[in-house]
Interface confidence: low
């Protein structure tokens, strides 16, 4: 009779993470008598996966009933595969011995490769807001994928970016891999509604890439422009001065009116108008009783936007041009001075 051979017909098996791997093994003879064991790896450090004779292997089931006396199919199934299960599995026949069984013959081995999907890309931006024309960095991370081959692209509002650097770790063999990419984006005033997208393509995704996004509204600060103007008011001896605060983002804004350097009123912008580009406009007004002032009045609109140093714009009101018996305000002039 021909000597027993251990046949592992599959050189390699590819399984998706979470699925069940079937590792096939058959023997060509019932002799010699003795159990089968499965190992991952070879040599003295090999890991026991299944022992027909004894032990508890909760993730492993046999394909056929090994208690049948004439059974020669020693295939196993390993459930809930993870990338950590990757490796070469050997089906080994032992010969019954005393006191210990003796290894008789090994199969050629089956390489189990695990395909694991990358995690959803997480895009993070800078910790602090930046103003238009500044370059900011965004990072994108995705983990746990296998095999190592992966493609990452960056987009801003659908336009592909080219200024980025990507690393896949580790460099050598591993059960799973991570990707880390940093992209540089130049902010513009129109970026409040913009999105930065990191797109990851991998064999496990079957052509449907994963995307992570960051909204530039979380990153950008558009500082306001100020304009102080004087409006005619019908009421006698009163002048209405408005401060137009335009094109700012985010909404967090506090405005203070100063009369000759003294605080007159403080307001917080809330009911603002929104521009198409996502920035805001706001208007505050101050009603000045000219008759209460003997001398010219310097009115200052001071704006603190998003915790930044205040910017201001002033307007000189010529009291001499406002005789108490007239409501005229024609001589008031706007100096347009810009103070920081």
């Amino acid at each position: 009779e021909e000597e027993l051979q251990v046949i592992q017909p599959d050189k390699s098996v590819l399984v998706a993470a979470g699925e069940t791997a079937t590792l096939r093994c058959t023997a060509t003879s019932l002799i010699p008598v003795g159990p089968i064991q499965w190992f991952r790896g070879a040599g003295p450090g090999r890991e026991l996966i299944y022992n027909q004779k004894e032990g508890h292997f909760p993730r492993v089931t046999t394909v056929s009933d090994l208690t049948k006396r004439n059974n020669m199919d020693f295939s196993i199934r390993i459930g809930n595969i993870t990338p950590a299960d990757a490796g070469t599995y050997y089906c080994v026949k032992f010969r019954k011995g005393s006191p210990d069984d003796v290894e008789f013959k090994s199969g050629a081995g089956t390489e189990l490769s695990v395909r694991a999907k990358p995690s959803a890309p997480v895009v993070s931006g800078p910790a602090a807001r930046a103003t238009p024309q500044h370059t900011v960095s965004f990072t994108c991370e995705s983990h746990g994928f296998s095999p190592r081959d992966i493609t990452l692209k960056w987009f801003k509002n659908g336009n592909e970016l080219s200024d980025f650097q990507t690393n896949v770790d580790p460099v050598g063999e591993s059960v799973s891999y991570s990707i880390h990419s940093t992209a540089k984006v130049v902010l513009t005033r129109e970026d409040v509604h913009s999105q930065v997208i990191c797109e990851v393509a991998h064999v496990t995704l079957q052509g449907d890439p994963l995307r992570g996004t960051a909204n530039l509204s979380e990153t950008i600060r558009v500082p306001p422009t100020l304009e102080v103007t004087q409006q005619p008011v019908r009421a006698e001896n009163q002048v209405n001065v408005t401060c137009q605060v335009r094109k700012f983002y985010p909404q967090r804004l506090q405005l203070t009116w100063l009369e000759n350097g003294n605080v007159s009123r403080t307001e917080t912008a809330s009911t603002v108008t929104e521009n198409k580009d996502g920035t805001y406009n706001w208007m505050s007004w101050l009603l000045v009783n000219v008759s209460a002032h003997r001398d010219d009045v310097k009115l200052t609109c001071q704006v603190e936007h998003d915790g930044q140093p205040a910017v201001s714009k002033s307007h000189d009101l010529k009291v001499s041009a406002h005789p108490k018996e007239q409501g005229s305000n024609t001589a008031a002039e706007n100096t347009g001075s810009n103070e920081r």
Partner: antibody, heavy 123, light 107 residues
Amino acid sequence: QIQLVQSGSELKKPGASVKVSCKASGYSITDYAMNWVRQAPGQGLEWMGFINTYTGEPTYAQGFKGRFVFSLDTSVSTAYLQISSLKAEDTAVYYCARTRGYYDFDGGAFDYWGQGTLVTVSS
Amino acid sequence: DIQMTQSPSSLSASVGDRVTITCRASQNVGTHLAWYQQKPGKSPKALIFSAIYRYIGVPSRFSGSGSGTDFTLTISNLQPEDFATYYCQQYNTYPLTFGQGTKLEIK
């Protein structure tokens, strides 16, 4: 001026359905998320969730998944709350309230509220 | 979920008084906190956002302070129209959550 105007009070029997409307005016409804807040008689305020008025995507708080549906008709600037299989414990005033969105520092503060719709469920 | 605890649950005060309502979050919410006023049979009215900023039209006698987990709403020089129920609300984390309310009554 900005207003959120809700539909009138409803008296319903257990098991029935109700649809509450919230019409936005004075601003573009698609610029602000629309939230729904419940206030049971004599109780405090409870956030039910919101609908992204730009994408139409709803987000429901944990206790409001299943029988509660948020929807939107941008052509008439109106958000809707539908409750099915009504129970006595659904008796409450339901408010719509707008928020700026969820990326800004004041993102989840409700700056404007509807007047509320009382839904009474009784057999 | 983040629990918001207001204290006291109710308080009595007189016109002209200064009152303080506190709100404690079960975890850090930064400055993502708002305050609302509600009168019987009416919808809530927004008073304060981002812990300290008054909405336009809210009288300056209302002021907010705090960050992290501890916040206060202070009403100085109480007016007759200020007697109402006040709620705090965090918007740092979903789900958005409110305090149980503080009822301010006339003494």
